[in-house]
């Protein structure tokens, strides 16, 4: 079976997000990926979308992320734009209305996105072969 176009869009967005750091990418996010042993793939994607939404909702107007220059502000706006796109596409892939997110360890956003990219690339290699 062919790969979902949403999956390709997610990988593309993750590539954009992981190529460059911003002031916000060192901040922490709930690491649901480390605690996804006994969950279905759909639940993992749903939880990833949930924690990403929590992250950008919390940090969208965070002065630590907005920075002191127009350049840093622009990059932060771009980061939020890509996170919102990723969130939207993960919900589409998950196909679930909601999912519980338990307390878990924290990870930096950049590490979380790198691991999510690895998971998505593995999924893509399986569905394209």
């Amino acid at each position: 079976h062919k790969c979902d176009i949403t999956l390709q869009e997610i990988i593309k967005t993750l590539n954009s997000l992981t190529e460059q750091k911003t002031l916000c990418t060192k901040l922490t996010i709930t690491d649901i990926l480390a605690a996804s042993k006994n969950t279905t793939e759909k639940e993992t994607f749903c939880r990833a979308a949930t924690v990403l939404r929590q992250f950008y909702s919390h940090h969208e107007k965070d002065t630590r992320c907005l920075g002191a220059t127009a350049q840093q502000f622009h990059r932060h706006k771009q980061l939020i734009r890509f996170l919102k796109r990723l969130d939207r596409n993960l919900w589409g892939l998950a196909g679930l209305n909601s999912c519980p997110v338990k307390e878990a360890n924290q990870s930096t956003l950049e590490n979380f996105l790198e691991r999510l990219k690895t998971i998505m690339r593995e999924k893509y290699s399986k569905c394209s072969s």
Partner: antibody
């Protein structure tokens, strides 16, 4: 294909204000997430960034020129402009306008440049 | 302000030679580094972005590497049309260019 073209007087008197305009063709200057910048190059020397203006309308300027520089955008004319006040002979240079930013990246600095315009400061 | 130190300031090499230019940042700039080529009387042309990515349409003999503070730009086999001045540029915190490296043919 996006093109940038600088225009303005080639000769400015000392202590006056240098005014240049960059006209963008082949695309909209309002297109998010692109931003616009000015860079200059004195004869026989290297490149110096002057300043940039972003989609939000916010600007960044080179700290060494900040007190004398203003960059603004006129979306109706698809142009952005540079004003540099109290010029001296040290401001004699080729002035370039350029585009930064990208749709598929967080940032991407100055990939498209105008051809440049020579400005001489002399009485 | 972030300072960019580029070396050498000029070099002379033969056609087919491997040419290497280095750029050092005064602080960590991650991978926010571009390399430009400027021919006499022309505007700079972006060759490499984010330290190692080749801009579309740029020949594969051009390459870049590095991260943090130390960066390298390489022309694997110098061609006559590569005669130009090359600049590095950081855009991690505002924008600063290196002093340039003038490349000539022996």
């Amino acid at each position: 294909q996006l093109q940038l073209q600088e225009s303005g007087p080639g000769l400015v008197k000392p202590s006056e204000t240098l005014s240049l305009t960059c006209t963008v063709s082949g695309g909209s200057i309002s297109s998010i997430p692109y931003y616009w910048g000015w860079i200059r190059q004195p004869p026989g020397k290297g490149l110096e960034w002057i300043g940039s203006i972003y989609p939000s309308g916010s600007t960044d300027y080179n700290p060494s020129l900040k007190s004398r520089v203003t960059i603004s955008v006129d979306t109706s004319k698809n142009q952005f402009s540079l004003k540099l006040s109290s010029v001296t002979a040290a401001d004699t240079a080729v002035y370039y306008c350029a585009r930064g930013g990208a749709r598929d990246r967080i940032d991407h600095a100055f990939d498209i440049w105008g051809q440049g315009t020579m400005v001489t400061v002399s009485s | 302000d972030i300072q960019m130190t580029q070396s050498p300031s000029s070099l002379s090499a033969s056609v087919g030679d491997r040419v290497t230019i280095t750029c050092q940042a005064s602080q960590d700039i991650s991978n926010y580094l571009n390399w430009y080529q400027q021919k006499p009387g022309k505007a700079p042309k972006l060759l490499i972005y984010d330290a190692s990515n080749l801009e579309t349409g740029v020949p594969s003999r051009f390459s870049g590497s590095g991260s943090g503070t130390d960066f390298t730009f390489t022309i694997s086999s110098l061609q006559p049309e590569d005669i130009a001045t090359y600049y590095c540029q950081q855009y991690y915190d505002l924008y600063t260019f290196g002093g340039g490296t003038k490349v000539e043919i022996k």
